[in-house]
């Protein structure tokens, strides 16, 4: 957030940018959490996403029996590895073709035992609040499909009649990692030292990271005619003075008529 400064006072402003703000010759460029002419104000809402997509990674091991292991397969830049990678990727693309969340495979290691293929199956889905269920279902389908293909595509009389053949017992799922999206945690982190005062509220299934100074939410602080301002000790109402009234109180809800006070003073003098 930026505020432009014109005139003689600008040089003074330059040295007074607060909260890590930097002077660009015209104005203070404020870090994400701050705004105002001097970056002196704390924002009342922080954009926390959500991300467009959520990813999952399944660590799998399969044993390919239609290729004999050679030392060259350990070298990822060798012609042997590159050819194996191409065939294995094509085979897995066929195996997982019915899974909309499937992105691809990534071979991490090839080792002896016919060819033991340690690899990751990569999944991705659009973010919705149900993303965990969607990815959990996809990982179950991956398990079913790889189990099926490694049971069906096997060597017969020492020859494979498929693109690749497998050892039925060599298929294992080592680990499943889903990218965790935790709006509460993100909100707390991005609010930094004000983290205790920012909360997540949902609107149309979208999370909003807000402080009580953001109007229109259930946690919003009503400062009446005053202004809500965030400080390290929490949100506070800065009360205004009008031509006719002074306002005070925690929510600036106590108004004192100036004329009454002045009248009172005149009476005493």
């Amino acid at each position: 957030r930026t505020t432009t400064c014109f005139g003689d006072g600008c040089q003074n402003t330059a040295s007074r940018c607060k909260n890590g703000g930097t002077w660009d010759g015209l104005k203070c460029q404020c870090p994400n959490l701050y705004y105002g002419e001097l970056c002196e104000e704390v924002v009342s809402s922080i954009d926390i996403g959500p991300p467009e997509t959520i990813s999952a990674q399944m660590e799998l091991t399969v044993t390919v029996t239609s290729v004999k292991f050679t030392e060259e397969l350990k070298n990822h830049s060798s012609q042997e590895f590159q050819e194996f990678k191409q065939t294995f990727t094509e085979q897995m693309n066929i195996v997982y073709s019915g899974i909309p969340e499937y992105v691809g495979v990534n071979i991490t290691k090839l080792r002896l035992g016919s060819v033991v293929v340690e690899h990751d199956v990569l999944l991705r889905t659009k973010y919705t609040p149900e993303y965990k269920t969607v990815l959990d279902n996809a990982t179950e389908v991956v398990k079913e499909k790889i189990t099926k293909v490694t049971t069906q595509q096997i060597m017969i009389n020492d020859i494979c009649s498929d693109m690749m053949c497998f050892n039925t017992t060599g298929t294992q799922v080592q680990n499943i990692t889903v990218t965790q999206y935790d709006p509460e945690e993100d909100c707390r982190k991005m609010a930094k030292e004000y983290g205790d005062y920012f909360v997540v509220e949902y609107r149309d299934q979208k999370p909003y990271c807000i402080s009580p100074c953001e109007p229109g939410f259930s946690v919003s602080k009503n400062c009446n005619l005053g202004k809500c301002q965030m400080s390290l000790s929490g949100p506070q109402c800065l009360c205004v003075t009008t031509e006719t009234h002074w306002y005070s109180g925690e929510t600036c809800n106590q108004g004192t008529q100036k004329s009454l006070v002045y009248g009172h003073h005149h009476h005493h003098h």
């Epitope: 290729v67 004999k68 060798s78 012609q79 009649s161």
Partner: nanobody, 123 residues
Framework: DVQLQASGGGSVQAGGSLRLSCAAS????????MSWFRQAPGKEREGVAI???????GYADSVKGRFTISQDNAKNTLYLQMIGLKPDDTAMYYC?????????????????WGQGTQVTVSS
């Protein structure tokens, strides 16, 4: 780029014999595998025979006992000796190669292909 060129095809009577050759541009596949495939009109390409650098050979059931695959690494050449030819053996014959020590007679497992040579067996 690896080049494979098949030759030796022709027309023979049933029961006759032919020897096919496949010349590779270099000895790249001496540590991998080479194979012969064939494709009859209107049919899918099918595996005939395979030889690997470890000396292993494999054959399709339909040609076992009649066809013999071999290679001469010094000449970078693959051979297919065919005897007792039948009209069913009529097809375009292709050689294929791989850097991998393969045990697969599915064309999708093979990445490098030569031009075909036609074999016609009449009754």
């Amino acid at each position: 780029d690896v080049q494979l060129q098949a030759s030796g095809g022709g027309s023979v009577q049933a029961g006759g014999s032919l020897r096919l050759s496949c010349a590779a541009s270099d000895n790249t596949f001496s540590r991998g595998s080479m194979s012969w495939f064939r494709q009859a009109p209107g049919k899918e390409r099918e595996g005939v025979a395979i030889i690997s650098s470890d000396g292993w050979t494999g054959y399709a059931d339909s040609v076992k006992g009649r066809f013999t695959i071999s290679q001469d690494n010094a000449k970078n050449t693959l051979y297919l000796q065919m005897i007792g030819l039948k009209p069913d053996d009529t097809a375009m014959y292709y050689c294929a190669a791989s850097f991998l020590v393969l045990r697969a007679l599915n064309p999708k497992a093979w990445h490098y292909w030569g031009q075909g040579t036609q074999v016609t067996v009449s009754s």
